[in-house]
Interface confidence: low
């Protein structure tokens, strides 16, 4: 056949869904690849074909449209399985073509199967809450377009594997989930199991995500530098080794670019000649506050090095900070058998 | 009310030497902010001059052209910010400001300007 | 050193216009860029940073966007006292920069 413009597996879009659940995947050339969308792709006479590789094989093959209760059917530009079967997981391929232009992209589909406490290997959205800083919600995730909105599901809310109720901080609102005040007691996993009817069937759709409590904007503060501090001097005598740690402490901060960096001279140390090397060590409190440790290191350190300005610099969202550390050369200690004895007046 | 007074611009001769001030009232220049000076010649766009980081009085840095001409300091004492200025030239004829941020060139605090003149 | 481009130099419109002033950085900066307004015989007044931060104060019709090397303010509806000139700062988190601001956008009455 004539040339298609094929862009490959997208492995970008590695799409779970669990097994037994209906599906809606929308061909992904409308959403990430084509500057027009299905509507006008349709419109200009361009056909949507879809075909899919079975897991472990390597023949592409039509996808059946004839099986029982329409379980797997297409709509405009989207693949509906009602509901999905284990052995549905395989790349799946959507190409739109007419006699003149053709494009396709596929990628993989995974149906997971999850345990009655709703734990699979499906890869989970984490939601981030701020700790005591008022009511904050979760909406219950990739549910628009299985019902019409005259249809109205029922939404049961689970922590872990228990059903919420009765929680003294979280209620359940429906497609929502309040948190009164997120406190790090509430860091879990998070299910809402959605219930609506379909032609006289019943569906279940099941989505969880990960709640994480972080540090409040309210308690953000600029960097604070730990280290380097007026209290400690670093005196060597040329030919020791300099080890001079640059500690910085971040508030959590969403979305915060945090960064920690040297400058020796006012030049960042790739830029001058010295042999200098920097290791950097990240950790975290519980709630995302982090704290970076970048030790700056001379291995045989000069005179000359030691008359250098060391500076750590810290950077984040709130504001950027900067401290010298105090470098000096040690006084070598007098040897006391000349310059003491000398001072006695020994002879 | 927060502000910055600037002071000390004027006329001098090429080569010679000028002391800018920049006062601060209603908040300490001690506290750990970045204290810039920014310059802008007559009709001509914004360019920047020199920072000192106050929260640690030795941390200052210099635009490649200042070349050791200029120094910044400051007297926490006196709540101010300097630009020691020598071997002044003709190009150095501009609108001098004194800014202050909390990151280095967010500068959310400005003072007035003073003009600095550099002829025979 | 870093080199901020900034398109248009000047540009005229009208009360009521979307205005986009663009600013290119010639590395890699982050979001580390600032917008600046200045009116004649006046200091420069902070608008935003962080690229997309409203400063405390400025109306909501100033945004600002992008990130890396690309970079724009927006304002989405022109008031009269917005004629004026924007400087985008390039805020080169090493600082060894030089020149970080950008060359000016004068936005004057059509």
């Known amino acids: 056949s004539e040339r298609c413009d094929d862009w490959g597996l997208d492995t970008m879009r590695q799409i779970q869904v669990f097994e037994d659940e209906p599906a809606r995947i929308k061909c992904p050339l409308f959403e990430h690849f084509l500057k027009f969308n299905y509507s006008t792709a349709h419109s200009a006479g361009l056909t949507l074909i879809w075909y899919w590789t079975r897991q472990d094989r390597d023949l592409e093959e039509p996808i059946n449209f004839r099986l029982p209760e329409n379980r797997i059917s297409k709509e405009k530009d989207v693949l509906w399985f009602r509901p999905t079967l284990l052995n549905d997981t395989g790349n799946y391929t959507c190409m739109l073509r007419n006699t003149t232009y053709c494009s396709k992209v596929a990628f993989p589909l995974e149906v997971v199967q999850k345990d009655s406490c709703f734990n699979s290997p499906m890869k989970l959205p984490v939601h981030k809450l701020y700790i005591e800083y008022g009511i904050q919600r979760i909406t219950c995730p990739n549910v628009d377009g299985y019902f019409p909105s005259s249809v109205k599901p029922t939404i049961t809310w689970y922590m872990g594997c228990y059903k919420i109720q009765n929680f003294n901080n979280v209620i359940p609102e429906g497609m929502n989930l309040s948190f009164l005040i997120a406190l790090i007691s509430n860091n879990g996993n998070y299910t809402c199991v959605v219930t609506y009817p379909e032609n006289g069937r019943t569906f279940h759709l099941t989505r969880t995500l990960t709640v994480k409590v972080v540090g409040s904007p309210k308690n953000a503060v600029p960097p604070v530098i730990h280290s380097p501090n007026d209290h400690v001097v670093y005196e060597k005598e040329p030919g020791e080794e300099l080890l001079i740690p640059c500690t910085v402490y971040f508030s959590f901060l969403m979305d915060s670019r945090n960064e920690v960096w040297w400058t020796i001279d006012g030049k960042k140390p790739d830029d001058i000649t010295i042999d200098v090397t920097i290791n950097e060590s990240i950790s975290h409190s519980r709630t995302e506050d982090e704290t970076r440790t970048q030790i700056l290191s001379i291995k045989k350190v000069t005179s000359e090095d030691l008359k250098r300005s060391y500076v750590c610099h810290a950077r984040s969202a709130k504001g950027e900070v900067a401290k010298a550390a105090k470098v000096k050369q040690k006084v070598p200690a007098p040897r006391y058998t000349v310059e003491l004895a000398c001072g006695f007046g020994a002879t | 009310e927060v502000q910055l007074e600037q002071s000390g611009g004027g006329l001098v001769q090429p080569g010679g030497s000028l002391r800018l001030s920049c006062a601060a009232s209603g908040f300490s220049l001690s506290t750990s902010y970045w204290r810039c000076w920014v310059r802008q010649a007559p009709g001509k766009g914004l360019e920047w001059v020199s920072c000192?980081?106050?929260?640690?009085?030795?941390?200052?840095y210099y635009a490649n052209w200042v070349n050791g001409r200029f120094t910044i300091s400051r007297d926490n004492s006196k709540n101010t910010l300097y630009l020691q200025m020598n071997s002044l030239r003709a190009e150095d004829t501009a609108v001098y400001y004194c800014?202050?941020?909390?990151?280095?060139?967010?500068?959310?605090?400005w003072g007035q300007g003073t003009l600095v003149t550099v002829s025979s | 050193d870093i080199v901020m481009t900034q398109s248009p130099s000047s540009l005229s419109a009208s009360v009521g216009d979307r205005v986009t002033i663009t600013c290119q950085a010639s590395?890699?900066?982050?979001?580390?860029l600032a917008w600046f307004q200045q009116k004649p015989g006046q200091a420069p007044k902070l608008l935003i940073y962080d690229a997309s931060t409203l400063a405390s104060g400025v109306p909501s019709r100033f945004s600002g966007s992008g990130s890396g090397t690309e970079f724009t303010l927006t304002i989405s509806s022109l008031q009269p006292e917005d004629f004026a000139t924007y400087y985008c700062l390039g805020v080169y988190t090493h600082i060894s920069a030089d020149n970080a601001f950008g060359g000016g956008t004068k936005v004057v009455i059509k």
């Open positions: 590395e890699d900066i982050y979001s580390n």
């Open positions: 800014a202050s941020g909390v990151g280095f060139g967010y500068f959310n605090l």
């Open positions: 000192i980081y106050a929260g640690s009085g030795d941390v200052t």
